[in-house]
Amino acid sequence: SERCDDWGLDTMRQIQVFEDEPARIKCPLFEHFLKFNYSTAHSAGLTLIWYWTRQDRDLEEPINFRLPENRISKEKDVLWFRPTLLNDTGNYTCMLRNTTYCSKVAFPLEVVQKDSCFNSPMKLPVHKLYIEYGIQRITCPNVDGYFPSSVKPTITWYMGCYKIQNFNNVIPEGMNLSFLIALISNNGNYTCVVTYPENGRTFHLTRTLTVKVVGSPKNAVPPVIHSPNDHVVYEKEPGEELLIPCTVYFSFLMDSRNEVWWTIDGKKPDDITIDVTINESISHSRTEDETRTQILSIKKVTSEDLKRSYVCHARSAKGEVAKAAKVKQKVPAPRYTVELACGFGAT
């Protein structure tokens, strides 16, 4: 057959679906690879063909669309499972072609088992809620397109294993789960189970997400440099090791890039000839406020090094701050014998 533009295996779109639940999978060609949509392709006479490779097999085979109750079907650019089975796991390929054009992409589909408490190997999306911020909500994700708007599904929310009912500050409202106040105790996995009828059958969609309660933007402050500070002087003799920690507190800020860096005489350490090393450690509070520590280390400091300016800098979306470390050369203590001799006027 003629050449086909093969986009390969799109592992970026590792699709995971639960066993024994409906799944609708859109052909990634139109979403990520081609500049036109399915309708345009279809009206131009292109045909979308699906096939798959079973798990641990090399053989590509057509998808059987003649299973009882149309368990697997295709509708436009969507491959439907009603429902999935464990052995549907494999690599799926959608190919768009006519006599003169061909383009295809493969993607992995993993059918995952869950236990009665919704635990599974599924990778969970994380939804961040601001602590003590006011009314916030999460929405049951990825349920669009499974049933028409005329169908009114029933939705049950769970936190971990427990049905959310009279949960005090957490209120189920259909597809939404409202948090009147978000507290650290609200951290955890939340599951919505959507139940809807279709052609005399009842289907369930299970969606789990992780809620993480984080610092509120109303409480956010510019970076705070705890060290260096005015109370600590780094007094060293030449030849000793100089260690200066730069410890900075960053309030949690959604999508903020937190940065800490040292300058020595106004230059980045990489741009000067001193043998300096910098080690960084990061810790987080329960609300994802961040403390970064960068330790500047000069193994054998020279008297020249002790005259330099060492400045710790920090930046976040809230602002930029800097603080110089107090570094000085230790004055050697006078030797006792010399001091005595001088005291008695000895020459």
Epitope: E132, I135, R137, N169, E173, I181
Partner: antibody, heavy 122, light 110 residues
Framework: EVQLEESGGDLVQPGGSLRLSCAAS?????????MCWVRQAPGKGLEWVSC?????????YYANWAKGRFTISRDNSKNTLYLQMNSLRAEDTAVYFC?????????????WGQGTLVTVSS | DIQMTQSPSSLSASVGDRVTITCQAS??????LAWYQQKPGQAPKLLIY???LLASGVPSRFSGSGSGTDFTLTISSLQPEDFATYYC????????????FGQGTKVVIK
């Protein structure tokens, strides 16, 4: 004793302004509370006006009809809730109640003041 | 905005009667419904929240039921102090938020 006490109600001319206060005693505004205003026109039913979150964010919420004319605020250090009412109309004549919402108890409106009367008339 | 329709607008009853007041929401409010009692010249008093939970200090003759759009307040055996006006109140947090009261039901002595 846990209670709310409204003040500031008065006779005001149409187009005028008024600031109502609600002093809380026996409890402190906290991050588990929303503080709200509800009004009741003479001989009529209850109507929600506005709420404010008593936590640090101080997020505010208004009934659609109240947006732009009414402003809710609070001073946690004084344990006092306020409602600034501007461009007052005859139909704003009502008893104004302040109420506490317990967010840690399914959002129950568990404490109400006795109300203060606002009369808008020329 | 959600509309709350209370019925009846008033009812006559005798001490000891079982009284039922209904409240209908224009769209689903799930279990986000409260009931209040108000006497002339007084503030409303919370009776029921989250559709069926009895507020602190409220006698057990008051009960609430329902979810979605249809809700009921029941007084199992009317007492003299129960003659008052009763209001339902919906809460919608995911859109808004918005709190809406019913127009009230006045319970009078037959």
């Amino acid at each position: 004793e846990v209670q709310l006490e409204e003040s500031g109600g008065d006779l005001v001319q149409p187009g005028g302004s008024l600031r109502l206060s609600c002093a809380a005693s026996g409890f402190s505004f906290s991050s588990s509370h929303y503080m709200c205003w509800v009004r009741q026109a003479p001989g009529k039913g209850l109507e929600w006006v506005s709420c404010i979150y008593a936590g640090s964010s101080g997020n505010t919420y208004y009934a659609n009809w109240a947006k732009g004319r009414f402003t809710i605020s609070r001073d946690n250090s004084k344990n006092t809730l306020y409602l600034q009412m501007n461009s007052l109309r005859a139909e704003d004549t009502a008893v104004y109640f302040c109420a506490r919402v317990d967010a840690s108890s399914s959002g129950s409106w568990d404490l109400w003041g006795q109300g203060t009367l606002v009369t808008v008339s020329s | 905005d959600i509309q709350m329709t209370q019925s009846p607008s008033s009812l006559s009853a005798s001490v000891g009667d079982r009284v039922t007041i209904t409240c209908q929401a224009s769209e689903s409010i799930y279990s986000n419904l409260a009931w209040y009692q108000q006497k002339p010249g007084q503030a409303p008093k919370l009776l029921i929240y989250a559709a069926s939970l009895l507020a602190s200090g409220v006698p057990s003759r008051f009960s609430g039921s329902g979810s979605g759009t249809d809700f009921t307040l029941t007084i199992s055996s009317l007492q003299p102090e129960d003659f008052a006006t009763y209001y339902c109140q919906s809460a919608s947090y995911s859109t808004g938020p918005d709190w809406t009261f019913g127009q009230g039901t006045k319970v009078v002595i037959k």
